[in-house]
């Protein structure tokens, strides 16, 4: 494949958290700015996926800064929107439930849960705080809801209302009609390249969401953010926006799309259905 083809391949892996951001600035790190005031503000934390308090210095900073918790939630969370993710009659586990627990490359260890496909149970592990994969849940309950079998052997569904792709209407969860398309893309792909705090000069790649390509940068060896990949291939696989076309039996069709033959156009950040 040429670089052009590689850059425009639709990636169908579901190893990373689905893109939830309504605005790209929601992915920015909290920035207190250079001034010395002490002002209580709120920012959206892409790692906890919640709006949190921080102290703002009073000048500069970035757009991920809100006067109130409510304003932050309104701009950066989707409590008032329904995510379109798979809901089928007999739900399969998402592919990521079968991934090995992955602590990632950082060392800010925190408790997380993963689905152990051998024991068929959600179990605790220590996550390093960056990278890793989607078999990584903040709570045992979330892990159980998504990956463990329910009492009837089906998956417990916590994904929300499904879109009927035929007429764009909201369909109850008991529907037999599966959604035709799903969208997966990690939120940290929208964050800027971050060298980090150390003094090394390691060759890494980051996804530049403005130009839609993976670009090299020099990593200091510690700190930084999750938009940090050891190879261009890994960066592309994680961050190129992709659709998964679902056929009626629940199988997946991997779709390749090149620039000249674009058949489907769906906006990157606005894949959600407003409440009716």
């Amino acid at each position: 494949d040429s670089e052009e083809d590689e850059e425009h391949t639709i990636i169908t892996d579901t190893e990373l958290p689905p893109l939830k951001l309504m605005h790209s600035f929601c992915a920015f790190k909290a920035d207190d700015g250079p001034c010395k005031a002490i002002m209580k503000r709120f920012f959206f934390n892409i790692f906890t996926r919640q709006c949190e308090e921080f102290i703002y210095g009073g000048c500069e900073g970035n757009q991920n800064r809100f006067e109130s918790l409510e304003e932050c939630k309104k701009m950066c969370t989707r409590d008032n929107a329904n995510r379109i993710i798979k809901t089928t009659l007999q739900q399969e586990k998402p592919d990521f439930c079968f991934l090995e627990e992955d602590p990632g490359i950082c060392r800010g260890y925190i408790t997380r849960y993963f689905y152990n496909n051998q024991t068929k149970q959600c179990e605790r592990f220590k996550y390093g705080g960056c990278l890793g994969n989607m078999n990584n849940f903040e709570t045992l309950e979330e892990c159980k809801n998504i990956c463990e079998d329910g009492p009837n052997g089906f998956q417990v569904d916590n994904y929300g209302t499904q879109l009927n792709a035929v007429n764009n209407s909201l369909t109850p969860q008991s529907t037999k009609v599966p959604s035709l398309f799903e969208f997966h893309g990690p939120s940290w792909c929208l964050t800027p390249a971050d060298r980090g705090l150390c003094r090394a000069n390691e060759n890494r790649f980051y996804y530049n969401s403005v130009i839609g390509k993976c670009r090299p940068f020099k990593y200091s060896g510690c700190g930084g953010n999750e938009n940090n990949f050891t190879s261009k291939q890994e960066c592309l696989r994680a961050c190129k926006k992709g659709f998964i076309q679902r056929i009626s039996k629940g199988g997946l069709i991997k779709t390749k799309r090149k620039r000249k033959k674009q058949r489907v156009k769906i906006a990157y950040e606005e894949i959600f259905v407003k409440n009716m």
Epitope: E100, E101, Q118, T119, E123, R124, F125
Partner: antibody
């Protein structure tokens, strides 16, 4: 019955290498993360490192990072500890221990003694 | 790293009498999931460690109910209601809340 049996210990010179093994039986080995823990003579216990269920990822104590490598062979129900650039302070009984679903060590082997001395 | 401090380091006891070991951590062992990953190990002379208690107070299978664990936050206690000859050995507390796992220095229980 869960059994963990370590082997491969012995006397080695400073700077030398040694590979320890832990043979597991009585449980589905591939279902569990595994650990190495050591105990210097007359001293307390020190966690050395952990390997994930499938063996793709590892965690290490700062004291052994870059010198020790944990691996596993799930087909052989075996856990390994490759120790390089050994120092006198690495002298200890090395135990392998199973990790339960709470990420806590539940079963321990009988240990194998590693002595680093010139 | 979290420092675990046990007292006493040596505990001479009379058979049939109670015994108590204290374990303090340098920071709270209450994890984000609401659980406290404080555990106790028993190491009999010449043997490998054996887990006695996990999550502060849960007894491992086969552990006699004369052993009880209690505590919260940073202060924990292991109690033996009536010491028996087979209880002789070294007892370690260790924490699995924060990485890396860390152990207390051990408390040697011996018969007077």
């Amino acid at each position: 019955e869960v059994q963990l049996v370590e082997s491969g210990g012995g006397l080695v010179k400073p700077g030398g290498s040694l590979r320890l093994s832990c043979a597991a039986s009585g449980f589905t080995f591939s279902s569990y993360a595994m650990n190495w823990v050591r105990q210097a003579p007359g001293k307390g216990l020190e966690w050395v490192g952990t390997i994930t269920t499938g063996g793709s990822y590892t965690y290490y104590a700062d004291s052994v990072q870059g010198r020790f490598t944990i691996s596993r062979d799930n087909a052989k129900n075996s856990l390994y500890l490759q120790m390089n650039s050994l120092r006198a302070e690495d002298t200890a009984v090395y135990y392998c221990a199973r990790q339960d679903g709470n990420f806590l060590m539940d079963y321990w082997g009988q240990g194998t003694l590693v002595t680093v001395s010139s | 790293d979290v420092v675990m401090t046990q007292t006493p380091l040596s505990l001479p006891v009379t058979l049939g009498q109670p015994a108590s070991i204290s374990c303090k951590s340098s920071q709270s062992l209450l994890d984000v999931d609401g659980k406290t990953y404080l555990n106790w190990l028993q190491q009999r002379p010449g043997q490998s460690p054996k887990r006695l208690i996990y999550l502060v107070s849960k007894l491992d299978s086969g552990v006699p109910d004369r052993f009880t664990g209690s505590g919260s936050g940073t202060d924990f206690t292991l109690k033996i209601s009536r010491v028996e000859a087979e209880d002789v050995g070294v007892y370690y507390c260790w924490q699995g809340t924060h990485f890396p796992f860390t152990f207390g220095q051990g408390t040697k229980v011996e018969i007077k």
